[in-house]
């Protein structure tokens, strides 16, 4: 969480951003809130990016003002116009690109004053893993697949019964470049699995951590997966 303040005394307003990550090819949100003002026509929101000459986005007098917008963001940005009056200056970024990563500044002017806060935006690819029993294999084998990751993640297997065990010797992980030549498909195979045990396939890079669990018993198979973004710090 990053909290920024304006220049001095009563002419400062609090602006708060949250560091976040964007999944390339999908839409992302750059989060920014500020002390709300009841005078909508006085509110100005400017999004800037370090190293970029033009503006990322500008909202003033109740509408988008995009004459100064940088070419790389053309047609890809929007604020939640109906939420500006309650202090939401968050930016929706369409079709996130790898090059969108960097330091952004959310700069706010209201009738009460000015304020700004920086936001670190990371970009990459992350997806939920699915763990299945590989019936084609000669021994009891689990196969963990996740369609899109970047940068290349690490994959670690764990088991509920053998906690702390190192499965690197009995697992094999491969990374296959996807057609757009950036993201990769992750496939990890775990051999010699035992029945009545819960296994976890953990995939992690510096942006996200995802886990796929599978519980195999004689009568059923239960799966569960979840994904967590890392470094969601507020400013």
């Amino acid at each position: 969480l990053i909290i920024g303040f304006g220049i001095s005394g009563r002419h400062s307003i609090t602006v708060t951003t949250v560091a976040s990550a964007g999944n390339i090819g999908e839409d992302g949100i750059l989060s920014c809130t500020f002390e709300p003002d009841i005078k909508l026509s006085d509110i100005v929101i400017q999004w800037l990016k370090e190293g970029v000459l033009g503006l990322v986005h500008e909202f003033k007098e109740g509408k988008d003002e995009l004459s100064e917008q940088d070419e790389m963001f053309r047609g890809r940005t929007a604020v939640f116009a109906d939420q500006v009056i309650v202090g939401n200056a968050s930016l929706r970024l369409k079709n996130v690109q790898l090059t969108d990563a960097g330091t952004y500044k959310c700069y706010i002017i209201t009738s009460k004053g000015k304020g700004n806060a920086n936001l670190e935006y990371k970009t990459g690819a992350f997806s939920m893993p699915e763990v299945n029993v590989d019936y084609n294999a000669s021994s009891e084998t689990l196969r963990c697949e996740a369609p899109r990751w970047f940068p290349q993640p690490t994959v670690v297997w764990a088991s509920q019964v053998d906690q702390g065990a190192n499965f690197s010797e009995v697992s094999n992980t491969s990374f296959e470049l996807n057609s757009e030549n950036v993201t990769m498909k992750v496939v990890s195979v775990l051999y010699n699995v035992t029945i009545n045990n819960t296994y976890s396939c953990m995939i992690e890079n510096d942006i996200a951590k995802a886990t796929g669990d599978i519980k195999v018993t004689e009568s059923e198979i239960k799966r569960r997966s979840h994904l967590q973004l890392l470094n969601s710090k507020a400013s």
Epitope: E35, P36, I38, K39, L40, E61, G62, A81, D82, V86
Partner: antibody, heavy 117, light 107 residues
Framework: EVQLQQSGTVLARPGASVKMSCKAS????????MHWVKQRPGQGLEWIGA????????SYNQKFQGKAKLTAVTSASTAFMELTSLTNEDSAVYYC??????????WGQGTTLTVSS | EIQMTQSPSSMSASLGDTITITCQAT??????LNWYQQKPGKPPSFLIY???QLAEGVPSRFSGSGSGSDYSLTISNLDSEDFADYYC?????????FGGGTKLEIK
């Protein structure tokens, strides 16, 4: 659930002052503007003013400057409006209304003020 | 101060009808307009925000439209619950101002 609970009916003499309250629950009271709106019998709605409890910032409709005084006690999540030098024209229902997710999204049930000698 | 002219001030309609109420601002208010419904002895209730967006729990027979200085509220397939007073509110310029209201009565 957001709720705004206003104080009860008030009967006052001309020239007197009254203070009414609005207790908020269900959201962070200090972080959002609280507004007051006047409605005379059979008439429309008139914005009086607003207070931002976190900083005690106030904003008034020029028409009500000097007539209404807005205050808030954040620890009690309660906003107050004091009306001074009352006349018959001040007889009305007064509403508090929040700007939580949108402008005037939640309303109190209203406080009826009757000014009579 | 922006003036909001709401029309008609009163109207009558039958169950199942479609009606339209309009609000005209004295200047462009950039879609910063809400609609409220008020029943006798009750506070106004939040109906539509930012010209077109339905507030939570509001039936889809209510719709809002408009831009610039001209806005409208349409209620289709009128239900007995819909007979009430309606107000528009502009919050673009300070101070926020309401329209004069429309009383919708059953024919």
């Amino acid at each position: 659930e957001v709720q705004l609970q206003q104080s009860g009916t008030v009967l006052a003499r001309p020239g007197a002052s009254v203070k009414m309250s609005c207790k908020a629950s269900g959201y962070t009271f200090s972080s959002y503007w609280m507004h007051w709106v006047k409605q005379r019998p059979g008439q429309g709605l008139e914005w009086i003013g607003a207070i931002y409890p976190g900083k005690s910032d106030t904003s008034y409709n020029q028409k009500f400057q000097g007539k209404a005084k807005l205050t808030a006690v954040t620890s009690a999540s309660t906003a107050f409006m004091e009306l001074t030098s009352l006349t018959n024209e001040d007889s009305a229902v007064y509403y508090c209304t929040s700007t939580w997710t949108h402008y005037f999204d939640y309303w109190g049930q209203g406080t009826t003020l009757t000014v009579s000698s | 101060e922006i003036q909001m002219t709401q029309s008609p001030s009163s109207m009558s309609a039958s169950l199942g009808d479609t009606i339209t109420i309009t609000c005209q601002a004295t200047q462009d208010i950039v879609k910063s307009l809400n609609w409220y419904q008020q029943k006798p002895g009750k506070p106004p209730s939040f109906l539509i925000y930012y010209t077109t967006q339905l507030a939570e729990g509001v039936p889809s027979r209510f719709s809002g439209s408009g831009s610039g200085s001209d806005y409208s509220l349409t209620i289709s397939n009128l239900d007995s619950e819909d007979f009430a007073d309606y107000y528009c509110l502009q919050f673009y310029e300070f101070p926020p101002t309401f329209g004069g209201g429309t009383k919708l009565e059953i024919k």
